[in-house]
């Protein structure tokens, strides 16, 4: 190889060992019989050399640095050439570096021809291996503007006081043009301006200077977004840190065309604007940091540009002004991430503050709209607390657990509506009465309705799940001793049509000691399956549950248990079951940790089943499943 650099070209070529590979055979640059590991060629020099191996690209890299001095004379503006031409260089991974020095008052603009650039974060790499690393200067300090790949939106970067641009090309890459030009501009009075152009739908992830390290103190950086007028842009902050400010406040400022309040100032922790039509600017302003403990300011954000959806022009009013202790969250439903571009799905408050999830609280009327291509990507979760603090006031009081119609009218599917029902300890208990009798969900007879009620204890220390219940069964009411949460969970969009079937009334009743009592009035047509609470995890220690099972006059009930033994092993205490005839008070007691479970038994009158647990050893829990079937009486035994 021969490299000859013209005098006054201000070019230096450096060939050096790259990252060491585990190749056994070393490789050297051979120059006038000598083996050397590095070769530096300066302007005006001509050097002939070879490599001692067949694949020098596995060992060496080449750096070509051109210093451009705009301080002492005119600046060579225009398209930047690759010098020396790549065809004259050995086929090594090569980095072309242009180091432009200019006065503080002069603005320099890097213009990137198509394909534009896409910024990448730490640890990321470019698919084709071609990277652009751009840095600026503040006095003597180098500031990293960012590392970029091809095929993005960044079209121009403006800086002042100087710029260093490094273009890295893999040895096999055929590129022979720099792909950018330099122009002079008036002073930009800030660290830099990055212009990002969207032709159509798409997204761009951008970062503050020096990311992930700290943004320079008290500096200003601006991103200009060029967005076709018919599209909408939304900004979301992916990652940010705030430094410790002594004076001034760190903030972002938006210049949004058509806004009457330009610039719009936001804190970094605020929800950022969305649903913006056309071009806009975003600026990051640092502060004077505390000298002792400066901290770091850094920001990584995403701009998503997409077509406005039909829904984006529709305003929905969610009136929670008459509600108390209620919150409504609209959020993305969990999905597998796809690799292709997915338009954003945002919910907007007052059409401007858009984010992927939004929580509305009671006491106000809210206006919301959607910026989303497919509203099935969102769902709603609602929480409402009904609490009784004074047992004298609450006793016998009833509340309807019903989803408000305002919420049902929203174009987003309801996932969960949870009521937290709180009572004064040891003073009151609760009874749930459904509008339609409930069926308990079991493997043997699963619910196939569009919604279910999930009933669980709301006492933090207590792990007690009563079960999942849906309309169309035999459970007339559920009485519970203490605080519970009742969650209406929907399973199909058809819930909107079936919403009329929902309806549950909660009443505060005098305190009782059992954890739960289920009142069951079986229908003659079907088999009722019932199971102990906390199925699969076992009834909690020392917990007692009862079923009050009604048997009509002309029917006989068959009580069947689905295993021979309960399987419980007690550490302390005894686990037992009592089956008691309500009319005669006659009862049978079974030791669940010793006896076999009863064979199917027939009951001509209403009866109780009571199950009380001991403190079981781990892994030997109490789980029981039983059924009740009614058949017509053939002989009257009374």
């Amino acid at each position: 190889f021969e490299i000859a650099l013209p005098r006054e070209s201000n070019i230096t070529v450096l060939i050096k060992l790259g990252t060491p590979t585990l190749l056994a055979k070393p490789c050297y640059i051979v120059i006038s019989k000598r083996h050397i590991t590095m070769l530096s060629i300066k302007s005006g020099e001509r050097i002939v050399f070879t490599f001692s191996c067949q694949s020098p690209e596995n060992h060496f890299v080449i750096e070509i640095q051109k210093n451009i001095d705009c301080m002492s004379g005119p600046c060579p503006f225009g398209e930047v050439q690759l010098q020396p031409s790549t065809s004259l260089l050995p086929t090594l991974n090569r980095t072309f570096i242009w180091d432009v020095k200019a006065h503080k008052s002069i603005g320099l603009e890097l213009q990137f021809s198509i394909p534009r650039l896409r910024q990448i974060g730490p640890g990321e790499s470019c698919p084709d291996g071609v990277t652009h690393s751009i840095s600026g200067r503040i006095d003597a300090t180098v500031v990293r503007i960012g590392t970029f790949c091809s095929n993005g939106t960044v079209s121009r970067i403006k800086m002042q006081e100087g710029v260093k641009m490094a273009l890295h090309l893999p040895w096999f890459h055929p590129r022979n043009v720099s792909g950018f030009s330099i122009a002079n501009r008036s002073s930009i009075k800030r660290l830099c301006i990055i212009e990002s152009v969207f032709e159509g739908e798409g997204s761009a992830t951008l970062m503050s200077a020096n990311y992930p390290e700290g943004f320079p103190e008290d500096e200003l950086m601006t991103w200009q977004f060029v967005v076709p007028a018919h599209l909408r842009a939304s900004v979301s902050f992916l990652n940010f840190n705030l430094s410790n400010c002594e004076r001034k406040e760190e903030r972002v400022e938006y210049y949004i065309p058509g806004s009457t309040t330009n610039p719009e100032v936001f804190k970094l922790e605020d929800k950022q604007p969305g649903n913006m039509a056309g071009n806009f600017n975003l600026s990051l302003q640092g502060c004077d940091q505390d000298a002792q403990s400066p901290g770091i300011l850094r920001l990584q954000f995403q701009v998503l540009v997409q077509h406005p959806q039909n829904e984006s022009n529709k305003i929905y009013v969610v009136d929670l002004s008459n509600e108390r202790a209620m919150s409504l969250t609209i959020e993305p439903r969990p999905v597998k991430q796809s690799r292709k571009f997915v338009p954003g799905c945002f919910v907007c408050l007052e059409s401007r503050t858009c984010s992927s999830n939004l929580t509305l609280t009671s006491g106000s009327k809210h206006k919301i709209s959607f910026l989303c291509d497919d509203l099935t990507r969102l769902w709603m979760n609602v929480e409402k607390t009904i609490s009784c603090t004074d047992h004298r006031y609450c006793q016998r009081k009833s509340y309807s657990l019903q989803v408000p119609s305002d919420i049902l009218h929203l174009p987003v599917e309801l996932h969960d509506f949870s009521w937290k029902l709180l009572v004064p300890k040891d003073r009151l208990s609760l009874v749930l009465v459904p509008a339609q009798k409930l069926q308990q969900h079991t493997h043997e007879k699963p619910c196939n309705t569009s919604f279910s009620y999930l009933v669980a204890s709301a006492i933090p220390s207590q792990d007690l799940y009563f079960g999942s219940f849906c309309p169309g069964g035999s459970i007339k009411q559920i009485q519970v001793k203490q605080n519970i949460s009742v969650t209406l969970r929907t399973f199909a969009p058809s819930f909107q049509q079936e919403a009329s079937r929902q309806g549950l009334t909660v009443s505060f009743i005098p305190y009782f000691k059992e954890e739960g009592v289920f009142t069951v009035t079986p229908d003659t047509k079907s088999k009722v399956y019932l199971r102990t609470p906390n199925w699969d995890r076992g009834l909690p220690s020392l917990t007692s549950v009862s079923w009050n099972i009604s048997v009509p006059r002309d029917q006989v009930a068959c009580l069947t248990f689905f295993k021979e033994r309960s399987g419980v092993v007690c550490q302390t205490g005894r686990a037992f079951m009592i089956i008691q005839e309500q009319r005669t008070r006659a009862e049978e007691i079974f030791s669940l940790d010793e006896d076999v479970l009863p064979k199917p038994s027939f009951h001509h009158h209403s009866f109780w089943v009571n199950i009380s647990n001991c403190s079981p050893t781990s892994g030997k829990q109490l789980d029981l499943l039983f059924s009740v079937t009614l058949t017509p009486r053939t002989v009257d035994l009374t």
Epitope: P26, H35, I36, T37, M38, L39, I41, I47, S52
Partner: antibody, heavy 117, light 111 residues
Framework: EVQLQESGPGLVAPSQSLSITCTVS????????VNWVRQPPGKGLEWLGM???????DYNSALKSRLSISKDNSKSQVFLKMNSLQTDDTARYYC???????????WGQGTSVTVSS | DIVLTQSPASLAVSLGQRATISCRAS??????????MNWFQQKPGQPPKLLIY???NQGSGVPARFSGSGSGTDFSLNIHPMEEDDTAMYFC?????????FGGGTKLEIK
Amino acid sequence: EVQLQESGPGLVAPSQSLSITCTVSGFSLTGYGVNWVRQPPGKGLEWLGMIWGDGSTDYNSALKSRLSISKDNSKSQVFLKMNSLQTDDTARYYCARDGYDGAMDYWGQGTSVTVSS
Amino acid sequence: DIVLTQSPASLAVSLGQRATISCRASESVDNYGISFMNWFQQKPGQPPKLLIYAASNQGSGVPARFSGSGSGTDFSLNIHPMEEDDTAMYFCQQSKEVPWTFGGGTKLEIK
């Protein structure tokens, strides 16, 4: 493993000539040069000359007239021949590989040569 | 020929302390972006051992306490912390142009 081993006569009469052989292993003489360095007792190091991988030679100008370096690539041997020895040529003679960036990275143990009648 | 002047001629350093040996060349030994200055350690009855090549690169198997620096005409070898085993003669050597030349040597001892 790279190794160099010198072998010489030990004692040479004044005005006679000296022949030393350097046998190498672990590398090829076509790819690396070999230097000759000597060290008189209690003194410093003096470079004598070298033979490059391509067979060309360079000598210390003060000794060039009575020095000759050659090699046999197939036998992995380098030869030093020095004529008209005097008592001040008494020294330990080393061969050393010319590694990358001009460093003599591997040395032989040396052979002691005494010029005496 | 390039003349190398090594200083000091002898040096005594306490264990754990820093030893610094200097080498000055009569002209620059830089070429192709490399400083062709090497440092050797020699113990009695043994051949020289390469410590540092190209001014600042460690030879293979050389402990990290040996470091070299400099460019152009002024170079130094640093040993820190000094160990018992470091008692030896130290030579600088230039390989920019033939004849290769050595410094006069520095005798390093324990204080």
